[in-house]
């Protein structure tokens, strides 16, 4: 019983429960394939508890293994649109620091209009995650169709 | 060592580990797009630890941020079936209380026969989640093809 | 404060934080549909903390409910390739002990070149998970396109 009380009094941050769920803010200018994200209760159901946004990109604040997940839906899309504009590809990676740059997760749309996936990956404090959408098709900004998030799982 | 023993003696509920994984029970009558779920060890590998079922819909018992995931496979389906019956769409949302009604997750099948996704979202005690499948195609009841679950992640 | 220190001194294993993320090593010989996995920091971003590999298949070391996730991308693939070679199917299941053999997760590629999904499932110490890819198409070995992992969620 004492343990349960102690646990409740501990700040959640000390338990390492960093978590974020973001919604699409906007796409970049023509030569910039990055998606720009936003989060916070004023915007709806998005939030950041631990990680931060740096110019629309997600920056990690705690070392550990994270579950990274994403769903992106194309805004104006049918199976014929998707195949005619192929390849349209979504990649999630560490984009800074440059020394740690790597692609973590990559999917192509082919004849579909939505991609969704998730993976476990080690991330370090200061890692910035970028989500690159290559191709000419635009993503939907609907919050139930396009979202991106991370969840700290263990040290 | 004492801490480890204490932890094991604590009821899991006090740690907030609410979790559920459901299998499809049946679809609704003609004008009802909802999927009706079931869970429990007698049914196979489905279970409810914390959340409850209310007339086949999942009701949350603990406030917090949850990972919600779903996979739905159409029962008699090929890429031509899926495109001919387009749009077939799956939406997961809070359907009650009405004041909190919102779509959390939405995917269309286009030329595919399976959708699968996941997201982090805040849920409150009493929220009921509904999964709406719109269109004329029926979902598979195979437990490895169609399932729906939630996992409490943090307060 | 004492609790936080105690928690940090505890071996993570006692908290039940078993987790693994694997990358594709190779496919099996002609009559063997299994994918063979590998993991470890020397290989990149894959790892095993708790579970072990047994001849390229993942063996569970701790009873509990796990989140199992997978993404498989076909190596030389377009929507026409995928539909021409249909059915290409990926199934994740318990393959040993034989008494517990069951399919946990199943997806077909149809006209897509990537499948990705996740589910919660109870697993027991000694369960070995196999991932069967049926059909003639080969999976990509790119670590951002094909991966398989588990995360212990609760007892």
């Amino acid at each position: 019983q004492r343990f349960a009380q102690a646990q409740q009094q501990l700040p959640l941050e000390s338990l390492g429960w960093d978590v974020a769920e973001l919604q699409l803010n906007h796409t970049g200018p023509q030569q910039d394939p990055r998606l720009y994200w936003q989060g916070g209760p004023a915007l709806g159901r998005s939030f950041l508890h631990g990680p931060e946004l740096d110019k629309g990109q997600l920056r990690i604040h705690r070392d550990g293994i994270y579950m990274v997940h994403i769903q992106v839906t194309l805004a104006i899309c049918s199976s014929t649109t998707a195949s005619r504009h192929h390849p349209t590809t979504l990649a999630v990676g560490i984009c800074s620091p440059a020394s740690r740059s790597i692609s973590l997760l990559r999917l192509s749309f082919h004849q579909g209009c939505t991609i969704a996936s998730q993976r476990l990956t080690p991330l370090a404090r200061g890692d910035t995650l970028c989500t690159n959408l290559t191709g000419t098709l635009l993503p939907s900004r609907n919050t139930d169709e396009t979202f991106f998030g991370v969840q700290w799982v263990r040290p | 060592q004492r801490f480890a023993q204490a932890q094991q003696q604590l009821p899991l509920e006090s740690l907030g580990w609410d979790v559920a994984e459901l299998q499809l029970n049946h679809t609704g009558p003609q004008q009802d797009p909802r999927l009706y779920w079931q869970g429990g060890p007698a049914l196979g590998r489905s279970f409810l630890h914390g959340p409850e079922l209310d007339k086949g819909q999942l009701r949350i018992h603990r406030d917090g941020i949850y990972m919600v995931h779903i996979q739905v496979t159409l029962a008699i389906c090929s890429s031509t079936t899926a495109s001919r019956h387009h749009p077939t769409t799956l939406a997961v949302g809070i359907c009650s209380p009405a004041s909190r009604s919102i779509s959390l997750l939405r995917l269309s099948f286009h030329q595919g026969c399976t959708i699968a996704s996941q997201r982090l979202t805040p849920l409150a005690r009493g929220d009921t989640l509904c999964t709406n499948l719109t269109g004329t195609l029926l979902p598979s009841r195979n437990t490895d093809e169609t399932f729906f679950g939630v996992q409490w992640v943090r307060p | 404060q004492r609790f936080a220190q105690a928690q940090q001194q505890l071996p993570l294993e006692s908290l039940g934080w078993d987790v693994a993320e694997l990358q594709l090593n190779h496919t099996g010989p002609q009559q063997d549909p299994r994918l063979y996995w590998q993991g470890g920091p020397a290989l990149g971003r894959s790892f095993l903390h708790g579970p072990e590999l047994d001849k390229g298949q993942l063996r569970i070391h701790r009873d509990g409910i796990y989140m199992v996730h997978i993404q498989v991308t076909l190596a030389i693939c377009s929507s026409t390739t995928a539909s021409r070679h249909h059915p290409t199917t990926l199934a994740v299941g318990i393959c040993s002990p034989a008494s517990r053999s069951i399919s946990l997760l199943r997806l077909s590629f149809h006209q897509g070149c990537t499948i990705a999904s996740q589910r919660l499932t109870p697993l027991a110490r000694g369960d070995t998970l196999c991932t069967n890819l049926t059909g003639t198409l080969l999976p990509s070995r790119n670590t951002d396109e094909t991966f398989f992992g588990v995360q212990w969620v609760r007892p």
């Epitope: 803010n25 906007h26 970049g28 023509q30 936003q38 004023a42 709806g44 000419t136 635009l138 900004r141 | - | -």
Partner: nanobody
Framework: QVQLQESGGGLVQTGGSLRLSCTAS????????GNWYRQAPGKQRELVAI???????NYADSVAGRFTISRDSAWKALYLQMNSLKPEDTAVYFC??????????WGQGTQVTVSS
């Protein structure tokens, strides 16, 4: 309350052209995207064209190569140039502006009828 107002609809013969305009009754700040939707009788509302704050555009398959979306620099107006019109383009056309903070502004719609 800001209102959007469409104009430029009407009756036109197959192969003809129309230019739809959409103007705001007040100032809308931080616009992320301008969109044109259409709704034909008995059908769902369909997104036909998008223009982003950065100037990127996308079109539905059914109108690509025939329709062009544009805007003025201050987002005071949104336009849809429709060429080579077909009977299947007959619908009520709605303009929509969405802000970065997820507010949505809609017009009342303008009827476009293409006769054969």
């Amino acid at each position: 309350q800001v209102q959007l107002q469409e104009s430029g609809g009407g009756l036109v013969q197959t192969g003809g052209s129309l230019r739809l305009s959409c103007t705001a009754s007040g100032s809308i700040f931080d616009i992320a995207r301008g969109n044109w939707y259409r709704q034909a009788p008995g059908k769902q509302r369909e997104l036909v064209a998008i223009i982003t704050s950065g100037g990127a555009t996308n079109y539905a398959d059914s109108v690509a190569g025939r329709f062009t979306i544009s805007r003025d620099s201050a987002w005071k107006a949104l336009y849809l140039q429709m060429n080579s019109l077909k009977p299947e383009d007959t619908a009520v056309y709605f303009c929509n502006m969405e802000t970065f903070s997820y507010r949505n502004y809609w017009g009342q719609g303008t009827q476009v009828t293409v006769s054969s």
